[in-house]
Amino acid sequence: EAHKSEIAHRYNDLGEQHFKGLVLIAFSQYLQKCSYDEHAKLVQEVTDFAKTCVADESAANCDKSLHTLFGDKLCAIPNLRENYGELADCCTKQEPERNECFLQHKDDNPSLPPFERPEAEAMCTSFKENPTTFMGHYLHEVARRHPYFYAPELLYYAEQYNEILTQCCAEADKESCLTPKLDGVKEKALVSSVRQRMKCSSMQKFGERAFKAWAVARLSQTFPNADFAEITKLATDLTKVNKECCHGDLLECADDRAELAKYMCENQATISSKLQTCCDKPLLKKAHCLSEVEHDTMPADLPAIAADFVEDQEVCKNYAEAKDVFLGTFLYEYSRRHPDYSVSLLLRLAKKYEATLEKCCAEANPPACYGTVLAEFQPLVEEPKNLVKTNCDLYEKLGEYGFQNAILVRYTQKAPQVSTPTLVEAARNLGRVGTKCCTLPEDQRLPCVEDYLSAILNRVCLLHEKTPVSEHVTKCCSGSLVERRPCFSALTVDETYVPKEFKAETFTFHSDICTLPEKEKQIKKQTALAELVKHKPKATAEQLKTVMDDFAQFLDTCCKAADKDTCFSTEGPNLVTRCKDALA
């Protein structure tokens, strides 16, 4: 239904707190360099204006679109060109081009310092002094670093943050209460960020239909008792919500997400028997809970998939007359039978099925041509299963850090032209799949591993797009989203790469490494490992292990030495020489 004033409508629907949070996220995601105070001022102005529109929907400018209102605010910021360069050119455009322009200037890798967590006492003090401002800072800092973060989920994480601080700041030992809890939230939020970025990539590169297919597969796995019409309705609504968030329409997105949660809770009987616990929660927790609710029990009496999709006489007719419905039904039926498959795999199977029908249906005897299609799925299923087994075995043998190193070597060999920081970040993230997924029950491993890897590789593609350097990466990134992971897995050593010259300074370390937190130490060592591979792309695993063990021993010895500086300056060059010899 059309509203006289869109901004008043959203303010009323969302309430002041969520309205302000979402506007702050929107501004922080568009203008990623502005300070919190600059954005907070704009948010207050927008909120005050929204209130005037609530009081009188006919007041001046209240009928303007949200894009117009927000865009005008952003374009009125002083020194826009000095701070943002060509993004300022967006302000010469009219809506909807202006908003499209802002979206195109979102930076997935902004040059901002890492978000450092203050120490416990300081955090609790500023939280107690002004919880609203404290939370505002959190939203701002996360949103500007993650310009596609799913806004309603970010509000949920802020609420989690708030609850943790409220609880832990009352404890005697604040630090030991806060650290593990906040680390947990941070880890979950980072995963949420890469997953959502993948959804936006799907939407941006391949359109709504691609995202809707993803949603149908995912929802069918989770709600196998819901019928196709119900799954289609949920997928359509979920597509709209994600399209809005990916498009910067955060107020609409949050509002529609709340509506979807409401609908699901009012229609549990036709959706799933597992929703009640989620539905008892308040809004943000409810929506979050629904998004990761456990799979419902599969119906016991499902017929074989072949009946409708291979044996039926009307297969080709049904395909040709309504591909969206017929292939959507195939995806639904296959997915609800396979909660143990990744969404990426299910989409590959649906694509294979579609390609087979497209090839066969015009032939003289179509059933003879497409009759073996389900058997032809086997290699497509075996490939990711083998990937999971191989990688989880390796993870169990090496542990997370060792597993990350193995992946780092592998990916540096595949794409040695990629910058070392990007390779290290990717390998560390890819390596976390072990901890995240390999400990799960067998039937949950494959969906966990492959869908997580796909999201991480999407980030690799986004970073590479900014400065393309590797033909291997370009090849894998320019194909369809669901083919990316298999493409990367299939890459071998890049034979076109000319090895980097050995530079002693790259492998020269100083005593300051000893005081670094463990994570930073690991990154330093992994940076050296990537550089070694770039110097010797064909070095064997044994050679690299020898060098890295020697390196670890060197750090251990010098960090324990009474005179660390002398140890580093005398033993360092010896280490470099030994490294060169070991790799010769």
Epitope: K317, K323, L357, E358
Partner: antibody
Framework: EVQLLESGGGLVQPGGSLRLSCAVS????????INWVRQAPGKGLEWIGI???????FYATWAKGRFTISRDNSKNTVYLQMNSLRAEDTAVYYC???????????????WGQGTLVTVSS | DIQMTQSPSSVSASVGDRVTITCQSS???????LSWYQQKPGKAPKLLIY???KLTSGVPSRFSGSGSGTDFTLTISSLQPEDFATYYC???????????FGGGTKVEIK
């Protein structure tokens, strides 16, 4: 050399019927899908329908009911039966083969030279 | 209703020019089912490009296609005398019955 050759065009009165033929030489028609496409004088292309190798047919929404496609593999010929013809059906009618390996895609790699149908009183 | 809009409807260009023709579809075509045809007066159309960007064998490499979803482009990088003709895009959709051609773009000698 593969050739598609349309015939059967000519002048027909409004409300009349006409059957066009598309004779195929150089390939065995029984393995291919054939489309009919028309082009009114000075206008663009308009897809009419398709017949798959199996004999299954599909039509553009506007063509359903008045137009029927059939085939006789023994004669290596596809037909377009047109009924209740109107002045706006005046056009050059082409038959065209769908690229092998596709069934529903608009990829037509071999075309006949076309036959003109004029509907006028 | 299916809409396949080609623009411009005609373009005047000289030999050696770069020519770009666009085709906008509503709704989006199915699975990049988009083709480009060239038609010369009194002749049947000729398939140039299929799957939005794949060149039919024998078609010169100066022809290229790009795009996905709803927006597609045919580019002739350096127009040759034999390229003066009318160009059509063709789209396939969820239902085969919706197969449609664009209105055509006539490339004329300037």
């Amino acid at each position: 050399e593969v050739q598609l050759l349309e015939s059967g065009g000519g002048l027909v009165q409004p409300g009349g019927s006409l059957r066009l033929s598309c004779a195929v030489s150089g390939i065995d028609l029984s393995n291919y899908a054939i489309n009919w496409v028309r082009q009114a004088p000075g206008k663009g292309l308009e897809w009419i329908g398709i017949i798959w190798a199996s004999g299954t047919t599909f039509y553009a929404t506007w063509a359903k009911g008045r137009f029927t496609i059939s085939r006789d593999n023994s004669k290596n010929t596809v037909y377009l039966q047109m009924n209740s013809l109107r002045a706006e059906d005046t056009a050059v009618y082409y038959c065209a083969r769908t690229v092998p390996g596709y069934s529903t895609a608009p990829y037509f790699d071999l075309w006949g030279q076309g036959t003109l149908v004029t509907v006028s009183s | 209703d299916i809409q396949m809009t080609q623009s411009p409807s005609s373009v005047s260009a000289s030999v050696g020019d770069r020519v770009t023709i666009t085709c906008q579809s509503s709704p989006s075509v199915w699975s990049n089912f988009l083709s480009w045809y060239q038609q010369k007066p009194g002749k049947a159309p000729k398939l140039l490009i299929y799957e939005a960007s794949k060149l039919t064998s024998g078609v010169p490499s100066r022809f290229s296609g790009s795009g996905s979803g709803t927006d597609f482009t045919l580019t002739i990088s350096s127009l040759q005398p034999e390229d003066f003709a009318t160009y059509y895009c063709g789209g396939g959709y969820s239902s085969i019955s919706d197969t449609t051609f664009g209105g055509g773009t006539k490339v004329e000698i300037k």
